[in-house]
């Protein structure tokens, strides 16, 4: 399968729109600092270059890889030292090395303006203007603020960009068009991006065992009729493609993907009968949708599982002679036969199965050893099936913000050496769990919540570790990625954490609050909360809820006052008197 | 325009008890702490008891601590004052007082009041 040129095979495989959104894509998650126009320039040069390739694949420098021809061209970036610091030593460095060195600057958490949307009017003068550049900035500006995007589906995120532009700039009321549908995709991209940077922290940091363990019992879970060995196949596949991804090479990446849904669509009868409306769709919707297509129906009368891997004399012998395999198909079986269990459940009990045959088939009657293997999945089931019902029974009590400030206090407490803004982002979206997931079933709360749960604790591994302050966290984060949710439930207050000084600054507001939305106004709030807790650990739930009671209204008042300015100053040192006072500080 | 109407005055014999209410309006009640202050005849103000805006923190004179009781409604914008124990000192004009702020801290700052009720504890 070895071309002449990878360049052209590319270009030719995915035609010039989508090698340009990617190489774009691509440049802007190495170097996020980089102007917009640059970018543009790098990219055209780039395409006109493949486009020689094209034509002559024996013409000079046409032979060479694309990392040597990306590489080579961010390297060419004038400012590169003073924008980026020591990244500009990585064009010192030659392949691979020069791209595992990008791929290690990428930042998670870039020092860049927050998008501030503009009136639509605007937008739509934009869009009508200049309709390509105006997409390329979308790419561009989500690209360099999430680095580790799935760049096809990145794509697709563009062409429903796009298409909402095309519908609600001709309509009657453009706002009421299209704000909801820019809110809808706002909202899932943030979602995809955080997903896949767990993929990719899975490959990175765990290895590609771990991923494809993981992929095992999803795809299990989704395609229940499928053999093992066709999921099998799907898991290869779909590990290569988020290896390729993760690893920055998105024109090959998304080229797998395409294949891969092909495959998945010619083979459909052998999968899932979920997949027939997928597979009729355009290629970007026919991925997303197989993406996020609904579990099958498990196979009727599917034997115990026992019979296999408990009760036969054979499991000793069928686990020495391919132990991945063996417990591939462990994993299999429980996964197809408990859509009701999260991912990393099934991951814990095909740990849990593993360690109990490293030391039974050791022993000297293996079966007697492993026979009650079965019984210690009961805890480890248990466990997020109670601290699930807790939580929702909680969220059902507070509703969604009070139930984020209870995770804050929570997770403060845990871990107050975290910086504000990222307790902030992380217990706001732990909170989100209570709405995604609790209005489910019993049978869907599990899948739903604790595999949410493990995306949002990567945001915050992946956070932490740009500037680690915290040992716990370190410690939670690294030790096992299945254990990553347990670990941080059963962390207890710090008790070796020094409050922070009393800083009134930090309690200080100005008239400004009132003119924000009212996502904004909680998140002001929600850092008075975490700076509360960081200040007086040993608060209890009743006085911090007393102090955030008073900031409630005394934000309420001061915003209908006449002068708001002055409101905030003299309310605002009752206020901090008060609070302190109510905590004894 | 803040109006604050006091009620629940009236003559009563030493170790009685009076409940005293106070109206308001033409304001948002729960975005002020308010008290209860009195003047017994030929004498000077006397603060009596505080109640922040939503009834969290109360504070009393200590002459009145653990015979007289504040409470608030803010639903109904009604401030309270329940007085049990009484005494022949406890004789007094009572006026319902706005503060200027949500909270009990410091001096109280007064920019409201209403023209009083009659308390006369006598045998």
């Known amino acids: 399968d070895a071309h002449k040129s990878e360049v052209a095979h590319r270009f030719k495989d995915l035609g010039e729109e989508n090698f340009k959104a990617l190489v774009l894509i691509a440049f802007a998650q190495y170097l996020q600092q980089c102007p917009f126009e640059d970018h543009v320039k790098l990219v055209n040069e780039v395409t006109e270059f493949a486009k020689t390739c094209v034509a002559d694949e024996s013409a000079e420098n046409c032979d060479k890889s694309l990392h040597t021809l990306f590489g080579d061209k961010l390297c060419t970036v004038a400012t590169l030292r003073e924008t980026y610091g020591e990244m500009a030593d990585c064009c010192a460095k030659q392949e691979p090395e020069r791209n595992e060195c990008f791929l290690q600057h990428k930042d998670d958490n870039p020092n860049l303006p927050r998008l501030v949307r503009p009136e639509v009017d605007v937008m739509c003068t934009a869009f009508h203007d200049n309709e390509e550049t105006f997409l390329k900035k979308y790419l561009y500006e989500i690209a360099r603020r999430h680095p580790y995007f799935y760049a096809p589906e990145l794509l697709f995120f563009a062409k429903r960009y796009k298409a909402a532009f095309t519908e609600c700039c001709q309509a009657a009321d453009k706002a009421a068009c299209l704000l909801p549908k820019l809110d809808e995709l706002r909202d899932e991209g943030k979602a995809s991006s955080a997903k896949q940077r767990l993929k990719c922290a899975s490959l990175q940091k765990f290895g590609e065992r771990a991923f494809k363990a993981w992929a095992v019992a999803r795809l299990s879970q989704r395609f229940p009729k499928a053999e093992f060995a066709e999921v099998s196949k799907l898991v290869t596949d779909l590990t290569k493609v988020h290896t390729e991804c993760c690893h920055g090479d998105l024109l090959e990446c998304a080229d797998d993907r395409a294949d891969l849904a092909k495959y998945i669509c010619e083979n459909q009868d052998s999968i899932s009968s979920k997949l027939k409306e997928c597979c009729e769709k355009p290629l970007l919707e026919k991925s997303h949708c197989i993406a996020e297509v609904e579990n099958d129906e498990m196979p009727a009368d599917l034997p115990s599982l026992a019979a296999d891997f408990v009760e036969s004399k054979d499991v000793c012998k069928n686990y020495a002679e391919a132990k991945d395999v063996f417990l591939g198909m462990f994993l299999y079986e429980y996964a197809r036969r408990h859509p009701d269990y999260s991912v990393v459940l099934l991951l814990r009990l095909a740990k849990t199965y593993e360690t109990t045959l490293e030391k039974c088939c050791a022993a000297a009657d293996p079966h007697e050893c492993y026979a009650k293997v079965f019984d210690e999945f009961k805890p480890l089931v248990e466990e997020p099936q109670n601290l699930i019902k807790q939580n929702c029974e909680l969220f059902e009590q507070l509703g969604e913000y009070k139930f984020q400030n209870a995770l804050l206090v929570r997770y403060t407490k845990k871990v107050p050496q975290v910086s504000t803004p990222t307790l902030v982002e992380v217990s706001r979206n732990l909170g989100k769990v209570g709405s995604k997931c609790c209005k489910h079933p019993e049978a869907k709360r599990m899948p739903c919540a604790e595999d949410y749960l493990s995306v949002v604790l990567n945001q915050l591994c992946v956070l932490h570790e740009k500037t680690p302050v915290s040992d716990r966290v370190t410690k939670c984060c690294t030790e096992s990625l299945v254990n990553r949710r347990p670990c941080f439930s059963a962390l207890e207050v710090d008790e070796t954490y020094v409050p922070k000084e009393f800083n009134a600054e930090t309690f200080t507001f100005h008239a400004d609050i009132c003119t924000l939305s009212e996502k904004e106004r909680q998140i002001k709030k929600q850092t008075a909360l975490v700076e509360l807790v960081k200040h007086k650990p040993k608060a209890t739930k009743e006085q911090l809820k007393a102090v955030m009671d008073d900031f409630a209204a005394f934000v309420e008042k001061c915003c209908k006052a006449d002068d708001k300015e002055t409101c905030f100053a003299e309310e605002g040192k009752k206020l901090v008197a008060a609070s302190q006072a109510a905590l004894g500080l | 325009q803040v109006q604050l109407v006091e009620s629940g005055g009236g003559l009563v014999h030493p170790g009685g008890s009076l409940k005293l209410s106070c109206a308001v309006s033409?304001?948002?009640?729960?975005?002020?702490?308010m008290h209860w202050v009195r003047q017994a005849p030929g004498k000077g103000l006397e603060w009596v008891s505080g109640?922040?805006?939503?009834?969290?923190?109360?504070t009393y004179a200590d002459s009145v601590k653990g015979r007289f009781t504040i409470s608030r409604d803010n639903a109904k914008n009604s401030l309270y004052l329940q007085m049990n124990s009484l005494r022949a000192e406890d004789t007094a004009l009572y006026y319902c007082?706005?503060?200027?702020?949500?909270?009990?801290?410091?001096?109280?700052?007064?920019?409201?009041w209403g023209q009083g009720t009659l308390v006369t504890v006598s045998s």
């Open positions: 109640i922040s805006w939503n009834g969290n923190k109360i």
């Open positions: 007082v706005r503060d200027s702020s949500l909270f009990i801290v410091g001096a109280p700052t007064f920019d409201h």
């Open positions: 033409g304001f948002t009640f729960h975005h002020y702490a």
